[in-house]
């Protein structure tokens, strides 16, 4: 069973993965953000369900087109370079979501937008936090 | 259906440069990252680097760095990839493959490939 | 740079018979993985993506699994046509880079 510390550690990654997300998502929409228009043009796969920790295997094979988008923003946007930002990412989904279990990721027949993309797994990590809290 | 062709075979000498082609037809170039890999004679594949021809933003293998220049012209639908100071070590099949972020998971992959193009460096 | 260990380098098995080959990464690399099929005087051909999923027109009895940082592709019963060079690919971070290969031939 999840120890208290365990569960508050997996909080606060949840936390910092969150703030990631609403930071791309708040520089991409950015009114100054030239690239939006080809940006939004970037076909994201969404997760037919996403409710659970090894979930965010979703998320974990959408991080390399992420990087692609990310790299056509104006580096001022982000606090951080795309490659070392998504890194950061990929750390933190990695000690979520856990390097062993092999879970085969389930897409929606429709795609996304970056923007719809960022909106769902910011709500997946907003409901996450709620239930641990 | 996209497809890729490359220009023909070059011979040069160490120490030249050379520039090969990747034409792109069935779509528009601006749709793909052109990459470029190479394949040295009963050797395996090395990737060399790419370029985003909406923005020409590069990326390449830090072993080319310095030496490989590629560039794509939008207007013919065109890649290149250019190779300085050859040695005899870059003797190799060079080719063109594509990556898009704009249509499905697998083009996301090394889908579309050109036929190759054989570069003999030779003194 | 990632390194990807192809083994075995050589495989001599028999049309009919199963073919299981071997790709593992020297870290991480979730299911960024590849696999190519390449055939004497011709470019690399796609077959397996993300580690699983099956390229279009690629025949059913090829399939991609991946354990952890190790990932294999099986043939489940060898066509004349499959003897080739096979190479895996990881593109989880630049620079992209490609196993040895390893070369399936006729028994």
């Known amino acids: 069973a999840p120890t208290s510390s365990s569960t508050k550690k997996t909080q606060l990654q949840l936390e910092h993965l969150l703030l990631d997300l609403q930071m791309i998502l708040n520089g991409i929409n950015n009114y100054k953000n030239p690239k939006l228009t080809r940006m939004l043009t970037f076909k994201f796969y969404m997760p037919k369900k996403a409710t659970e920790l090894k979930h965010l295997q979703c998320l974990e094979e959408e991080l390399g087109p992420l990087e692609e988008v990310l790299n056509l923003a104006q580096s001022k946007n982000f606090h951080l370079r795309p490659r070392d930002l998504i890194s950061n990412i990929r750390v933190i989904v990695l000690e979520l979501k856990g390097s062993e279990t092999t879970f085969m990721c389930e897409y929606a027949d429709e795609t996304a937008t970056i923007v719809e993309f960022l909106n769902r797994w910011i709500t997946f990590c907003q409901s996450i936090i709620s239930t641990l809290t | 259906q996209v497809q890729l062709v490359q220009s023909g075979a070059e011979v040069k000498k160490p120490g030249a440069t050379v520039k090969i082609s990747c034409k792109v037809s069935g779509d528009t170039i601006t749709a793909y990252y052109m990459h470029w890999v190479r394949q040295a004679p009963g050797q395996g594949l090395e990737w060399i680097g790419r370029i985003d021809p909406d923005d020409d933003s590069t990326k390449y293998a830090e072993n080319f760095k310095g030496r490989v220049t590629i560039t794509a012209d939008t207007s013919t639908d065109t890649a290149y990839m250019e190779l300085s100071s050859l040695r005899s070590e870059d003797t190799a099949v060079y080719y063109c493959t594509t990556i898009t972020f704009y249509y499905s998971r697998e083009l996301r992959w090394f889908a579309y490939w050109g036929q190759g193009t054989l570069v003999t460096v030779s003194s | 740079d990632i390194v990807l260990t192809q083994s075995p380098a050589t495989l001599s098995l028999s049309p009919g018979e199963r073919a299981t080959l071997s790709c593992q990464a020297s870290q991480y690399i979730g299911n960024y993985l590849s696999w190519y099929q390449q055939k004497p005087g011709q470019a690399p051909r796609l077959l397996i993506y993300?580690?699983?999923s099956l390229a279009s027109g690629i025949p059913a009895r090829f399939s991609g699994s991946r354990s952890g940082t190790d990932f294999t592709l099986t043939i489940s019963s060898l066509e004349p046509e499959d003897f080739a060079v096979y190479y895996c690919l990881q593109h989880y971070s630049t620079p992209y880079t490609f196993g040895q290969g390893t070369k399936l031939e006729i028994k």
């Open positions: 993300s580690a699983t």
